[in-house]
């Protein structure tokens, strides 16, 4: 972690709880106001490696709903709509932070958790040709 | 939010702070132990819509380092290595949760923040607008 001098206006924390447990304000600040959320909404259908989105719901997690991408094909889609066996559709994965209720069912106590989610798919060449 | 009956073993929270402020344990639990983090690390180079990864660092945020994808080309890369301008490389974006120190520089007080990150790129057919 990065050592940051405490500001005198900071909430108190006992040493035994710091930095293990912190206070988090759940009033989400959204930095994406200028971004149209629909921008990438149709890429899943128009991609040469199209994907479907599956809803993953867990009330013990925040956010409780996460959308997981599953590539529709193993290969990529050619201009004529048929499969290209020489290319592969693969999921692009990202580790994200979520809050897990801990102890379970507690409304105001969480643990930070890292989960791997598939965000979409991309089309890759299966073989990397190494040039001598 | 989902109303969940409080477990008697839960930490106390005063009504005025709930559900706005919660306690979060920062000892991250990683659910991805079975996943090899190197698996998709070379897709950015082998994709028909390759991307570069840019480091975005902010000590007032947790995690402080986030990697942002920027598509290398406007078009997509063909098998011969040339760019196909009839297709478009586009970023796949995802909203993720981060913790923002609030007040600034406070080590144990955060606000939840949603930010939009580009995770990778995919190759899509452009939308053709037909003029009547």
């Amino acid at each position: 972690g990065i050592a940051i001098p405490r500001n005198s206006g900071c909430p108190n924390s006992e040493d035994k709880n710091f930095p293990r447990t912190v206070m988090v304000n759940l009033n989400i600040h959204n930095r994406n106001t200028s971004t149209n959320p629909k921008r990438s909404s149709d890429y899943y259908n128009r991609s040469t490696s199209p994907w479907n989105l599956h809803r993953n719901e867990d009330p013990e997690r925040y956010p409780s709903v996460i959308w997981e991408a599953k590539c529709r094909h193993l290969g990529c889609v050619k201009a004529d709509g048929n499969v290209d066996y020489h290319m592969n559709s693969v999921p692009i994965q990202q580790e994200i932070l979520v809050l897990r209720r801990e102890p379970r069912h507690c409304p105001n106590s969480f643990r930070l958790e890292k989960i791997l989610v598939s965000v979409g798919c991309t089309c890759v060449t299966p073989i990397v040709h190494h040039v001598a | 939010g989902i109303a969940i009956p409080r477990n008697s073993g839960c930490p106390n929270s005063e009504d005025k702070n709930f559900p706005r402020t919660v306690m979060v344990n920062l000892n991250i639990h990683n659910r991805n132990t079975s996943t090899n983090p190197k698996r998709s690390s070379d897709y950015y180079n082998r994709s028909t819509s390759p991307w570069n990864l840019h480091r975005n660092e902010d000590p007032e945020r947790y995690p402080s380092v986030i990697w942002e994808a920027k598509c290398r080309h406007l078009g997509c890369v063909k098998a011969d290595g040339n760019v196909d301008y009839h297709m478009n490389s586009v970023p796949i974006q995802q909203e993720i949760l981060v913790l923002r120190r609030e007040p600034r520089h406070c080590p144990n007080s955060f606000r939840l923040e949603k930010i939009l990150v580009s995770v990778g790129c995919t190759c899509v057919t452009p939308i053709v607008h037909h003029v009547a």
């Epitope: 193993l74 290969g75 050619k78 048929n82 592969n88 299966p126 | -």
Partner: antibody, heavy 120, light 107 residues
Amino acid sequence: EVQLVESGGGLVQPGGSLRLSCAASGFTFSTYGMSWVRQAPGKGLELVAIINHNGGSTFYPDSVKGRFTVSRDNSKNTLYLQMNSLRAEDTAVYYCARDPRHDGYFFDYWGQGTLVTVSS
Amino acid sequence: DIQMTQSPSSLSASVGDRVTITCQASEDIYDRLAWYQQKPGKAPKLLISGATSLETGVPSRFSGSGSGKDYTFTISSLQPEDIATYYCQQYWSVPWTFGGGTKVEIK
């Protein structure tokens, strides 16, 4: 019940031709990728051809490229393999196999095979 | 082409034994691996796809694991009806290629 029945095998001289058929039943043939896989006597398995659900994509390994042609007639629920310029090394049991998806990557149902012998 | 090296080529084990077969690809195949069982005079039967996903109706004593280039097929408790030759197949890069097979016999 899914069934794949191959026919058309037999003895043929080197340089000759043969056309194999695979009659499919028990599933909607037009929505599945299909393949031909062969097995030389006492040997392992080798991919011969792949065709996607509508016939719009095909693939052949170098060992048969230019000599073999895979096709399908979805109205007749039948898969074909046209084999020309046959060689002794093409001697094998030829299986038709179904992919559980549209395209032909791995195979959840196989026929019982038809033996092709190339010999003078 | 991607080479699939399967080992051992044959093995003999007792009923109830744990049997392990390995398959090594010449390069990363990103879990795109299937395992088949072929009994003498019969067509192959799909057991596992995606390296670990057991096909419907396949007994749970069969399992698959691995990633990257190295994959393993396990029979947790060998049964008399498991006598067969087992093949792995990669479907990451065309042409799809098979391992040389492992013949499993009962001691």
